[in-house]
Amino acid sequence: ARWFPKTLPCDVTLDVPKNHVIVDCTDKHLTEIPGGIPTNTTNLTLTINHIPDISPASFHRLDHLVEIDFRCNCVPIPLGSKNNMCIKRLQIKPRSFSGLTYLKSLYLDGNQLLEIPQGLPPSLQLLSLEANNIFSIRKENLTELANIEILYLGQNCYYRNPCYVSYSIEKDAFLNLTKLKVLSLKDNNVTAVPTVLPSTLTELYLYNNMIAKIQEDDFNNLNQLQILDLSGNCPRCYNAPFPCAPCKNNSPLQIPVNAFDALTELKVLRLHSNSLQHVPPRWFKNINKLQELDLSQNFLAKEIGDAKFLHFLPSLIQLDLSFNFELQVYRASMNLSQAFSSLKSLKILRIRGYVFKELKSFNLSPLHNLQNLEVLDLGTNFIKIANLSMFKQFKRLKVIDLSVNKISPSGDSSEVGFCSNARTSVESYEPQVLEQLHYFRYDKYARSCRFKNKEASFMSVNESCYKYGQTLDLSKNSIFFVKSSDFQHLSFLKCLNLSGNLISQTLNGSEFQPLAELRYLDFSNNRLDLLHSTAFEELHKLEVLDISSNSHYFQSEGITHMLNFTKNLKVLQKLMMNDNDISSSTSRTMESESLRTLEFRGNHLDVLWREGDNRYLQLFKNLLKLEELDISKNSLSFLPSGVFDGMPPNLKNLSLAKNGLKSFSWKKLQCLKNLETLDLSHNQLTTVPERLSNCSRSLKNLILKNNQIRSLTKYFLQDAFQLRYLDLSSNKIQMIQKTSFPENVLNNLKMLLLHHNRFLCTCDAVWFVWWVNHTEVTIPYLATDVTCVGPGAHKGQSVISLDLYTCELDLTN
């Protein structure tokens, strides 16, 4: 028996280890809290709806609630959707929450609330009120929060949610919150650090405010603090893609030299965009446990050359000094202080946006003996010259990031072709600098309405490449030619990213010769000329090759394209050649005894497989181990009859999505004895097979969403016992008969998607209505989006809630 009604328009899941019952009603267009929420619900999410009020009745009988997420039901107008503006703020009636004696977490962000709600239960440990209209914090409003541990009050007064008054915090407002661990007042136009703060704090977020000066005793009692974020006070406004007001005379955030003396447990200090010109070592006198220091977006280019403060950070693991360039200055090279050599625990060093012309080996000498260094990020520096062999000193590094520079083919600084001594205005690089939306985002930790937790931390490198090991990222540079000497001494590299360069040479199998250990090569967004079938053959250990978006030469007629280069890559597992507009090939077949995945999206198989031309029907046949083939977006309005005979024998997954297919030879699936997943979504199919089981005995997943299917054949799923996943959503299906959906097949399904169709809810639908009400098969969006288009009285009604009692009477009569 089901323990909640199918009419509940929410996803219900059990977290058995935590003993949680989770009801998620995110973005269900609700205007009231739905009925039928199980009484044992522990976690209730109602974010992104239009519920206008909360009253004691709202959570009546939901006594086990531990967490309520009621965010974004009336988002402040400047922050919210312009086509669905909320003009009446959320009303919270007295005692709405007071009966919820187990409630620990309450999220009320984005509801235009004017005050901290009263009548909250003493069990509450987390209260989140971000993006409301609360800009006065008074002691009396916090008296009920005796057990609160986490308090989010940010984004209540800033450029995207203006309050037009100065944000006020009563003295000692937070002092009686004796269990408070995390306090966020970010994005609030706060002008001073609130005093006195409870000594229990472990995290304090004061970033993006209008604090111009820290007072000597602001943090005096915070001896348990582990994270302090003061970023964006006295911001560096150059190139800021948001309204930005620096402090008077562009002065830095003033921090007394002993301001941090009490913070003996501090692990993370963020001073991003504070217009700092100096970093006094005295700040760190007592902070010897500091692990992460963010000093990006300041004016520290000179300080980086002295950096005496680094001698006082023995435990530092992450250091970010990015975008500290002096305006209008293009330095000849990078000057790193010898003090960097003292950072024995350092794992991640980021110095983007220092802006210099030539990277020389001795520039990095202070880093040579840092045994724990894993990531060196020198992206977005407009480096023109770099002898890559210098990185032989950095074999232990996992990532060397030189992306978004102007590195061009090897040559020393005397080669006028690749450098110029003129002082270049950094302003001319503005669009590229703006592209980088990690350092130039107003609030990189902001939460969206959809997710409660802050966004993931910044990872600049392609994760799938990084997992193979040592990575050199040269993407988005000006490389137009590669030769083996460029990679001398880099045999330790496992991953090389050359994406987004200007390489247009005909590779012959010699260019990457030193890279004996390379497993992953990203060559996407270049201008590959596949004249030689020996291209890439020197990469004996290459497992993944991405040559997507290399369409330049494929778009020109009469050019040789040797697609059979794959036969020389003996361990290649995955090949991506998407968006290449491939419409011709000199070699008729691709060959490989190792390749398992081929992505061939965005090409022109419609031309290669043109009616009457059988030459390329076996293009993929000799990819003997191929299991996954994606040939979506190939403009295939039909498939010639020989296509399936020419498919590799071990194929498991085949995607033909977004092709404009008008018909499909279902019977031909018999050729694919191992096929498990077939994706035919986003086509123009109007029919399904007479009997799927006659076409394939192996198919487990069939995706037919976004087609033009109007009806299902009488015996569509008869004997299709292996099927586990069927997606028929976003079609034009009007009726489903019992014979099309035999129960002995349906009961094996893990997932059936039927939403966004055009069901006719006449008496002919009685069986279907009965079945969706009784089946245990998961049907997503059943309560909200599996609806009737007619007849009149039932238009827009959910199939699940149909009352076809009169039809049943007719049947019994």
Partner: antibody, heavy 121, light 107 residues
Framework: QVQLKESGPGLVAPSQSLSITCTVS????????VNWVRQPPGKGLEWLGM???????DYNSALKSRLSIRKDNSKSQVFLKMNSLQTDDTARYYC???????????????WGQGTSVTVSS | DIQMTQSPASLSASVGETVTITCRAS??????LAWYQQKQGKSPQLLVY???TLAEGVPSRFSGSGSGTQFSLKINSLQPEDFGSYYC?????????FGGGTKLEIK
Amino acid sequence: QVQLKESGPGLVAPSQSLSITCTVSGFSLTGYGVNWVRQPPGKGLEWLGMIWGDGSTDYNSALKSRLSIRKDNSKSQVFLKMNSLQTDDTARYYCARDKGYDGYYYAMDYWGQGTSVTVSS
Amino acid sequence: DIQMTQSPASLSASVGETVTITCRASENIYSYLAWYQQKQGKSPQLLVYDAKTLAEGVPSRFSGSGSGTQFSLKINSLQPEDFGSYYCQHHYGIPYTFGGGTKLEIK
């Protein structure tokens, strides 16, 4: 040119307090730290404490409970106060300027001529 | 606190000779070391900071060297005005501490 000049009482009775003033010229107290150092007769130098340009203070931990350093930027004066003097506090007391930016640990590049303090009843 | 140990405690030398005074720190102080000269009845004067940088106006016969825990001050071709006491001091964080001093006398 940079100058520092100490002025003190000369003689202090045991258990009494010592107050010394350091008057500076040629630089601003908001931009530099000022140290206090003493030297007992015939002995070496001992650092007592300092006041930074922003007014923050640091003290020798052995003397912290008895010491207080403050300043008046407008008068270009730095004040040392030391409580509960004993005979072993007899020494020449110097003020000296810290060489560099506020909050940076530098050497002392300019010294006063010192003022002699004798603790005796 | 960091201890600074100076040696020798006293030293006799003649004009024109070269002498070396050493200073050892109880822990790594990188190059945060200063040397001072103090003549009888006068206040100390800065000679060297950051272990090897000569202060303004200091003759080139003085030179500082070392890093980490071992440091030295070398005086080439001693002049009559070089006799007096010499002190090392670390400036690697608070509290600053001085060495016990080296008294350089005329032989």
